[in-house]
Interface confidence: low
């Protein structure tokens, strides 16, 4: 019995179905086929869970969180024992193993391993200003999304006819910050933060209004 090499790793957007491949060759009939799918969750590597089981011609549910979401892609028994997981959740991220036994065919590699990563687009980021908006001050524009896998990067743009930040601005796309030094009236305007990762983007807006000093009455 020989389980075929798997693609190694699969990525899927949260909520979308995933197919975890596992196929094998065997010299024996599939009368005594026994297939166990296990997962080692990324969130709890010390606690492997059973996903689904095929034994004695019957299918059995695995861990409760997979109930109603998991099944074999084809009619069993078969040499293709791939499974699907519907409505993928963040907690489904982990390393999946298919363990295949088909007596009397013993020997060879009977385990296939596939990694599953559930990706999450950035949630609507939160934009805010830190620091005084008085002319001549330094301000920091902050942007962060609560959700996003892989971790989003953040790009700030000034929404004027250049779509560029002022020359006095420095940007950290990992932290989502822009520091604008010595702000002037020209720094005023609408700024947009675009949070992006492999599967999506989301934006927020921020209105920076630089405050000019009030003229003093002399008298």
């Amino acid at each position: 019995l020989e389980v075929s090499e798997s693609p190694g790793s699969i990525q899927v957007a949260r909520g979308q179905p995933a197919v975890l491949p596992c196929t094998f060759t065997t010299s024996a009939a599939l009368i005594n086929l026994n297939v166990i799918w296990m997962v080692t969750p990324l969130s709890n590597a010390n606690q492997p869970e059973q996903v689904i089981l095929y034994q004695g011609g019957q299918m059995f549910d695995g861990a409760p969180r997979f109930h109603g979401r998991v099944g074999f892609t084809g009619t069993m028994p078969a040499t293709n024992v791939s499974i699907f997981i519907n409505n993928t959740q963040l907690s489904d991220t982990g390393t999946y193993q298919c363990l295949v036994n088909n007596l009397p065919d013993i020997g060879g590699r009977n385990i296939g391993v596939t990694g599953l990563t559930v990706l999450v687009p950035p949630s609507a980021p939160h934009c805010q200003i830190q620091g005084s908006q008085d002319i001549g001050s330094d301000v920091i524009l902050l942007c962060s999304s609560e959700e996003g896998i892989p971790r989003p990067t953040y790009l700030w743009e000034k929404l004027d006819n250049t779509l560029k930040l002022p020359p006095t601005a420095t940007q950290d796309q990992v932290q989502g910050t822009v520091t604008i030094r010595n702000i002037s009236a020209l720094s005023s305007g609408l700024y947009q933060c675009v949070a992006s990762n492999a599967i999506g983007t989301s934006t927020c807006l921020l209105d920076l209004q630089v405050i000019s000093p009030q003229p003093r009455n002399i008298g």
Partner: antibody, heavy 120, light 107 residues
Amino acid sequence: QVQLVQSGAEVKKPGASVKVSCKASGYTFTGYYMHWVRQAPGQGLEWMGWINPNSGGTNYAQKFQGRVTMTRNTSISTAYMELSSLRSEDTAVYYCARGGQQQLVLDDYWGQGTLVTVSS
Amino acid sequence: DIVMTQSPSSLSASVGDRVTITCRASQSISSYLNWYQQKPGKAPKLLIYAASSLQSGVPSRFSGSGSGTDFTLTISSLQPEDFATYYCQQSYSTPRTFGQGTKVEIK
């Protein structure tokens, strides 16, 4: 004056791809976002995404993620929208629209629309 | 995604009538709300941006109001050229979602 001129109507088979172009004139192409909006026959407007012609950065509606690609060629002031794995429900008029007041709206400068028909 | 809900979906009115169309957002969008008019076979035309600002060249009989989640487009005295479909659209976040449209027909 500002003009957006789109490519002509297309008929495609399910599973194929279509690439619609939008040639801009009368303004600085790299200074304004370009949005793409579609409208199925008898239906409402559906925003697909935008491209920043300056940086090439894009922002796609989640519904089209993985199927749509927006690009631009700044040397000829043209934006492109390519939609792949076409299905019958992609039959629609596709519009490009320039970002307007503070880039927040799709302003009065729209292309004339390109009808894409997906039929076997 | 922010869901924009327009009401009514259609209405019949006469020339000279005052017409009001409402648009509700599923979450607060501040004043980032735009109104468009579309006639058959034509591209949409911007009427109002930022909830209440009249686009240049648009007749003053069109006005917009509201902030947060509830918005209104008002046509103070309906003219023959105003029979069309009207859409609201939020520009607070992506995707830039539209309402389903309100068709204004001749009574």
